[in-house]
């Protein structure tokens, strides 16, 4: 008779990363016995669902049970059907759906109560799906990669396993950029958190942390480029925006009604002559920088100091890790080496900006035209940000890494939000246990 | 189902809080509107507490009113320096633009009088 | 402040007849569709008949059409039936989560 392997003593969990531009899927997978070591929950899959995000089908919620069905059908192939009822799923939205909320509670709980049905409808233990906040976003996205740095381990290593370790318990600060978003979370260096709002205290694995954090709202790469349309719109003697944040060449029409569609740009909204304008390429990076740092109002602080908009940042402290769109974007010009100064970015960016349209839709045949158009403000908006709105330095930039994934598993708040969900962060260093037969493999 | 509870003959310049019983549903997962009817007029919208507990009030409102979440299973509005203009029947809704079947309470009276 | 003006305050009807009536807004609903219809009869809340401007709310007889978008919107009763006479009301959802609800139409049934 054939040896049966004895089944894996694993355990597994999905959490759906509702953001503005995009749903993705993440399966997580650990092993039982190993549920409060820390660093052992893995990601085994991503799958992203096509389409736009979720507070896109505001005027289609009928849709939305199809825009899942891919996702939820490969989840159920990865994890196995015996797993399926305990496999927790758990939906958490972003930026997209906060903005929604804001126009409309009533379209938002709608479109979230579509999501609940369609996803209660499959066989997996499904927990509910909500609109996390800013701060919450901030929070697990610095758990996630501390988690998987393996910075909340007692146990000091002689070796290295994963990038960027220091071989310290120094944590690493999480730097979050989404359509809609983006958060800035570390810990300060015995430093006052100012503003409550801005502060959170965890005790994890018997440490405690007081950590730092903020969510800026309408200042992800999407809608920081809606709010630069807007309020360069204002000022434009006719319905043609020249404008030096896209390529020299490139040609876009822009419906008045889209720009001032969020509440992003309520507050530069004003009645325009043309109901449409269009927005023609110069390809200047100075150009562009300046405009995008009028979008960070840094003449009123009520603290000893600010990021923008009066909001508190103390003093930067350690390293970071820069990840989702801080990531794909630098990631796709080709900048995320340890190796590249800020300079040496500002230069490439210079260079890469006022490269005309036709040769850059030539260079990049495989990249589809609406994202590719964007890279030039996308990358500009990256510095701006750090630089002026965070107040990195052209000697503080060594200390960004940015990160796609750790380990395998994706650097992003999905993680962070299942670990604390599950209960699989103690709050106390677990009792060391005598060794089981899968200590060692 | 949403029942409204509260309403009573009250002096002007009182101050009276309105409960909203909700069952079958979660709070956290819904928005409760109060809405008005001075006997005789129309209705007039008050405001909303969204599952999130965030407050939205009409014009009007502001400042006077306030929408609280008090329990996992109530809502309170309430109504300060009362004048005979607020004499009306008082609803709590579930949802305001899609309140559907059962999402309305039978309304609860408030006469304001000396 | 956003204004709905509902006409006309009150209308007359036979039995089998058609009634229409008309809300106007001061500016845009949401989506351009976020308006909802009720129906009030005495001492009773308010009953939904139509959202989004012309889906039907289930139970809700298809004698009942609502049509229009972003500021003009009509609600058309046809084959009019006694049990029909009743106040109408609009209400409009608005960005930043404004509400504001029509004056009334008082419908009489001949």
């Known amino acids: 008779t054939q040896n049966k392997a004895l089944p894996e003593n694993v355990k597994y969990g999905i959490v759906l990363d509702a953001g503005s531009s995009h749903t993705s899927l993440y399966i997580y997978k650990w092993p039982a016995e190993k549920e409060n070591d820390t660093g052992v929950v893995h990601q085994v899959e991503e799958c992203r669902v096509k389409g736009p995000g979720i507070s896109k089908f505001v005027q289609k919620v009928n849709e939305i049970g199809i825009y899942l069905t891919d996702c939820m059908e490969r989840a159920r192939e990865v994890i196995p059907r015996s797993q399926h009822q305990e496999t927790p799923v758990y939906l958490g939205a972003t930026a997209g759906m906060r903005l929604l909320r804001m126009e409309s509670e009533e379209l938002a709980d709608r479109v979230l109560d579509v999501v609940e049905r369609s996803l209660s409808n499959y066989p997996f233990d499904f927990q509910g799906a909500r609109i996390i906040t800013g701060q919450e976003e901030g929070a697990y996205g610095w758990i996630t990669i501390n988690y998987l740095l393996g910075k909340f381990s007692q146990k000091t290593r002689w070796f290295s396993i994963v990038p960027y370790e220091t071989n310290n318990q120094e944590t690493f600060g999480a730097l979050d950029l989404g359509g809609a978003s983006t958060q800035v979370t570390f810990v300060p260096q015995n430093q006052t958190i100012e503003s409550p709002d801005n502060a959170l205290q965890f005790r994890l694995y018997g440490k405690d942390y007081n950590v730092y954090t903020h969510s800026f709202l309408c200042y992800g790469k999407d809608q920081a480029l809606w709010q630069k349309l807007a309020k360069d719109i204002q000022v434009a003697s006719n319905e043609i925006l020249r404008d030096p944040c896209f390529h020299p060449g490139y040609k876009k029409v822009v419906n008045v009604s889209d720009l001032y569609k969020t509440p992003c740009t309520k507050r530069f909204e004003m009645t325009l002559p043309f109901q449409q304008f269009e927005i023609q390429g110069i390809g200047n990076y100075q150009q562009c920088h300046q405009s995008i740092l009028e979008l960070f109002n840094t003449s009123y602080c009520p603290y000893s100091q600010c990021a923008f908009n009066g909001i508190f940042l103390p003093p930067l402290q350690g390293d970071f890790g820069a990840f989702s769109a801080f990531y794909f974007v630098m990631k796709f010009l080709n900048l995320t080496s340890e190796k590249v100064s800020q300079e040496k970015v500002t230069e490439m960016m210079k260079k890469f900006c006022a490269q005309p349209w036709e040769e850059i839709k030539t260079s990049y045949a495989g990249v589809k035209e609406k994202y590719l158009s964007e890279y030039c403000f996308s990358g500009t908006y990256i510095l701006s940000l750090l630089l002026q709105g965070y107040h990195f330095t052209a000697d503080s930039w060594e200390h960004i890494h940015f990160i796609g994934k750790i380990q395998g598993s994706d650097a992003g708040w999905t993680l962070g939000y299942m670990l604390n969900l599950t209960n699989m962060i103690p709050a106390e260093q677990p009792l060391s246990t005598p060794l089981s037969h899968s200590t060692y493999v | 189902s949403v029942e409204e509870s509260g309403g009573r003959l009250v002096t002007p310049g009182t101050h009276l809080t309105l409960t909203c019983t909700v069952s079958?549903?979660?709070?956290?997962?819904?928005?409760i509107s109060w809405v008005r009817q001075a006997p005789g007029k129309g209705l007039e919208y008050i405001g909303i507490?969204?599952?999130?507990?965030?407050t939205y009030y009409a014009n009007w409102a502001k400042g006077r009113f306030t929408i609280s979440k008090t329990s996992s299973t109530t809502v309170d509005l309430r109504m300060t320096s009362l004048t005979p203009e607020d004499t009306a029947t008082y609803f709590c809704?579930?949802?305001?633009?899609?309140?559907?079947?059962?999402?309305w309470g039978p309304g609860t009276l408030v006469t304001v009088s000396s | 402040a956003i204004d709905m003006t509902q006409t006309p305050s009150s209308v007359s009807a036979a039995v089998g007849g058609t009634v229409t009536i008309n809300c106007q807004s001061s500016?845009?609903?949401?989506?351009?569709?976020?308006l909802s219809w009720f129906q009030q009869k005495p001492g009773q809340p308010p009953k939904l008949l139509i959202y989004?401007?012309?889906t039907l709310e289930s139970g809700v007889p298809s004698r009942f059409t609502g049509s229009g978008s972003g500021t003009q919107f009509t609600l058309t009763i046809s084959d009019l039936e006694c049990d029909d006479a009743a106040t109408y009301y609009c209400?409009?959802?608005?960005?930043?989560?404004?509400?504001?609800f029509g004056g009334g139409t008082e419908v009489l049934v001949k």
């Open positions: 809704a579930r949802g305001l633009l899609y309140s559907g079947n059962k999402s």
């Open positions: 079958g549903f979660s709070l956290s997962k819904s928005i």
């Open positions: 507490i969204g599952s999130s507990g965030s």
């Open positions: 500016q845009s609903v949401l989506l351009n569709n976020q």
């Open positions: 989004d401007a012309s």
């Open positions: 209400l409009g959802g608005y960005s930043g989560n404004l509400y504001a």
